[in-house]
Interface confidence: medium
Amino acid sequence: DAEFRHDSGYEVHHQKLVFFAEDVGSNKGAIIGLMVGGVVIA
């Protein structure tokens, strides 16, 4: 199962989620780790 792992010890406040690539800007879409605490793919 592919999971995000939150390694911060506090509540994560997200930016707006995007679920379709048409909503991803050509630059923003390539950024990895916008979450507080970072992102790890299991």
Epitope: A2, F4, V18, G33
Partner: antibody, heavy 124, light 112 residues
Framework: DVQLQESGPGLVKPSQSLSLTCTVT?????????WNWIRQFPGNKLEWMGY???????SYNPSLKSRISITRDTSKNQFFLQLNSVTTEDSATYYC?????????????????WGQGTLVTVSA | DIVMTQAAFSNPVTLGTSVSISCRSS???????????LYWYLQKPGQSPQLLIY???NLASGVPDRFSSSGSGTDFTLRISRVEAEDVGVYYC?????????FGAGTKLELK
């Protein structure tokens, strides 16, 4: 480990509403991700129906938009599908599934966890 | 909607040999960010679908490296080398370039 389980009536009459529940264990539906309904028709065709994300925002397949509603009960960690005015064409196995968001990592827009599915037959 | 096209069946495969499964999209799935939004799922008999490949060529966690995927913007191939009995099932391609997310009709892998 997150687990999803669908439940609801297996038989619905034409013109009535189909209502299903997905119970999520091992993860809070308000913490992250989007929580989807997908159905599989006889013959294996898969159709994405829509989702409700962790913040309560919904997105629906335009082909169903006039008939579908996805809601949630955060206190029970459940989300729900309501499909109105059903016909025999809505007979299918209905899955709930979790998908993560492209905003966090562009690699992650996939269905990572699925329920086992529940068969719904529409018949008089 | 983007239409995903797959053959209903693969040629029957002998254990230990290789097989390729094809998928075609009605529109290029290559985004301006350089990523191709094509996924492969396997649905084993009696089970829910499971992810094999994400964004055209990346192997999902826990998937054996016997599986690989390649393609252009519209034509894609899933290759299984050294087919095992547990690989039997229906293989679906899917896209999330545009809403609604759409799946192919599935290709059934059968053994000789």
């Amino acid at each position: 480990d997150v687990q999803l389980q669908e439940s609801g009536p297996g038989l619905v009459k034409p013109s009535q509403s189909l209502s299903l529940t997905c119970t999520v264990t091992g993860y809070s539906i308000t913490s992250d991700y989007a929580w989807n309904w997908i159905r599989q028709f006889p013959g294996n065709k898969l159709e994405w129906m829509g989702y409700i994300d962790y913040s309560g925002i919904t997105s629906y397949n335009p082909s169903l938009k006039s008939r579908i509603s996805i809601t949630r009960d955060t206190s029970k960690n459940q989300f729900f599908l309501q499909l109105n005015s059903v016909t025999t064409e809505d007979s299918a196995t209905y899955y709930c599934a979790r998908i993560s968001g492209l905003d966090y990592d562009v690699r992650a827009g996939w269905f990572a966890s699925w329920g086992q599915g529940t068969l719904v037959t529409v018949s008089a | 909607d983007i239409v995903m096209t797959q053959a209903a069946f693969s040629n029957p495969v002998t254990l230990g040999t290789s097989v390729s499964i094809s998928c075609r999209s009605s529109k290029s799935l290559l985004h301006s960010n350089g990523i191709t939004y094509l996924y492969w799922y396997l649905q084993k008999p009696g089970q829910s679908p499971q992810l094999l490949i994400y964004q055209m060529s990346n192997l999902a966690s826990g998937v054996p490296d016997r599986f690989s995927s390649s393609g252009s913007g519209t034509d894609f191939t899933l290759r299984i080398s050294r087919v095992e009995a547990e690989d039997v099932g229906v293989y679906y391609c899917a896209q999330n370039l545009e809403r609604p997310l759409t799946f192919g009709a599935g290709t059934k892998l059968e053994l000789k």
